[in-house]
Interface confidence: low
Amino acid sequence: FGDEEERRCDPIRISMCQNLGYNVTKMPNLVGHELQTDAELQLTTFTPLIQYGCSSQLQFFLCSVYVPMCTEKINIPIGPCGGMCLSVKRRCEPVLKEFGFAWPESLNCSKFPPQNDHNHMCMEGPGDEEVPLPHKTPIQPGEE
């Protein structure tokens, strides 16, 4: 991301990551994908987990990893904070385990900054309910 010319941010073209509070990204992402199409392919494998509803932050978290936020002001992509990762992992890892899957190493929470500050910028994400209840369904983009 050396000079301004190369640094241009790209619109997010992955439908499940649109309308999440930021709309531009820059590849490669935080797991090494150079193309959004490759990122989208891997993101779709998480769709059942998103649909399950284990964490209201899951979709935002995954998008922040696979299409991290880009801003013209900083020359590095802004991904998730470790705290959001841990919150999502705490809720969703048991669901994954129940269906015979392990928490992916690519989403190892130690890879992400513990909190957002000037030295390590990251996204805290939307607030999460302490217990996910059907009557308090995850607030999603476009909620009325």
Epitope: P48, Q51, Y52, G53, F99, L133, P134, T137, G142
Partner: antibody
Amino acid sequence: EVQLVESGGGLVQPGGSLRLSCAASGFNISYYYIHWVRQAPGKGLEWVASIYSSSSYTYYADSVKGRFTISADTSKNTAYLQMNSLRAEDTAVYYCARSSYAWAIDYWGQGTLVTVSS
Amino acid sequence: DIQMTQSPSSLSASVGDRVTITCRASQSVSSAVAWYQQKPGKAPKLLIYSASSLYSGVPSRFSGSRSGTDFTLTISSLQPEDFATYYCQQSGWWGVSLITFGQGTKVEIK
């Protein structure tokens, strides 16, 4: 307030078609499973079809596969069930429903009656 | 596809009785099991989700539990408004048949 309102039910002859609508309010259908569940007179609940429209995933019960099509128009916040080649055994009250955590159906519509008879 | 065998199909009980309804899955399933109450002419109402979590606004006399492939709905002290039909629902992770309902249990006044 979350609401689901079905419409489109009625009397149809065997082999005919009908399209049911489910108008949702109070939430965005793009980010929830929407299901159609039916109940024949005096019988139990039978799952018919489901859609998760933000990912374009659809699912069908074997009994309706190839005859019924579930769809959604997110701009209208409405889900549909297109029913073709209807049979007498499709006679039922059809409920539109929404599920959230762990596929628990937390909101149901009032139901619309479909009668297939000659 | 997974079958959910619900038993009994009907039962007679008195106000104050403890009532237990069971659903047995035909194969190992997740805890994505819900229980519903339905009264004649009305849509079902969610009671229990994730096998044992009480849905908001549902009286605490209702509870759910799991033991292997057996899922149980218990009404600790039956009330007059509890006479209804109860259904279990199992949901798959990702597959052909997303939702399976049990056959229902009608709880009648003795």
